[in-house]
């Protein structure tokens, strides 16, 4: 036998105290599948969460944060404290990133400058608390003669010669 | 931490009305549904009625004496007896849930309960 409680849309509830009938959920609640024999409470964006999108009978709302704080954990669960560019958020509230790191967004952390001889080059724009380096070409390039503009010449496969 | 406290239970004559009062700390009721329920000597756990955004919802035995009230401002739910007949003897209980109605739910939190004693 077919179960009276499948027929009830998203949107309502199944009444076992009613003979199983539909009832819709009451205001500020709701069902997002049939079949259901509650309805969930709405979520409510209060203090530092906003509203997002209003919640419905079939849907629940969703929040996010108010300006200078952004969205932690699923769903934005949470609301961080933004900090400015060249800053981390510590235990003790927004610092600035300590000398060889740089943070280019209002939140996350500080992260270390690129090491630009690692991959045989050298530093073409130095590192501040709000952006990286850049690096440029190795320093082989630079050398009296190379050309600073023109590439080096890919290397090519033994036994091929130039087209 | 939430606490719910109840109160307004006590012996009552059979035919007689009695108020249970459910108050919360440490948390509003805005965002939850508010259920009672009792539990009589010896028997199960039976689910009384939810409360919530203005609608409440009731148990199957109850016969319209029960009604479910709340008032924001002191952040309490009541539940108003009338015509209170022996086999309402139980401690009665407050819950909350974040799913309505509660019949077939557990609750989040639960208080401690309150006895009524209807006898003459």
């Known amino acids: 036998l077919q179960d009276p409680c499948s027929n009830c849309p998203a949107g309502t509830f199944c009444d076992n105290n009613r003979n199983q009938i539909c009832s819709p959920c009451p205001p500020n609640s709701f069902s997002s599948a049939g079949g259901q024999r509650t309805c969930d409470i709405c979520r409510q964006c209060k203090g530092v969460f906003r509203t997002r999108k209003e919640c419905s009978s079939t849907s629940n709302a969703e929040c996010d944060c108010t300006p200078g704080f952004h969205c932690l954990g699923a769903g934005c669960s949470m609301c961080e404290q933004d900090c400015k560019q060249g800053q981390e958020l510590t235990k003790k509230g927004c610092k600035d990133c300590c000398f060889g790191t740089f943070n280019d967004q209002k939140r996350g952390i500080c992260r270390p400058w690129t090491n630009c001889s690692l991959d045989g080059k050298s530093v073409l724009v130095n590192g501040t608390k709000e952006r990286d380096v850049v690096c440029g070409p190795s320093p082989a390039d630079l050398s009296p003669g190379a050309s600073s503009v023109t590439p080096p010449a890919p290397a090519r496969e033994p036994g091929h010669s130039p087209q | 931490e939430v606490q719910l406290l109840e109160s307004g239970g006590g012996l009552v004559q059979p035919g007689g009305s009695l108020r249970l009062s459910c108050a919360a700390s440490g948390r509003t009721f805005d965002n939850y549904a508010v259920g009672w329920f009792r539990q009589a000597p010896g028997k199960e756990l039976q689910y009384v009625g939810t409360y919530w955004s203005g609608y409440a919802h009731y148990g199957d035995f109850e016969n319209n004496r029960f009604t479910i009230s709340r008032d924001n401002s002191k952040n309490t739910v009541y539940l108003q007896m009338n015509s209170l007949r022996a086999e309402d003897t139980a401690v009665y209980y407050c819950?909350?849930?974040?799913?309505?109605?509660?019949?077939?739910?557990?609750?989040?939190?639960q208080g401690q309960g309150t006895l009524v004693t209807v006898s003459s």
């Open positions: 819950a909350i849930s974040l799913k309505y109605p509660m019949a077939t739910v557990t609750p989040d939190y």
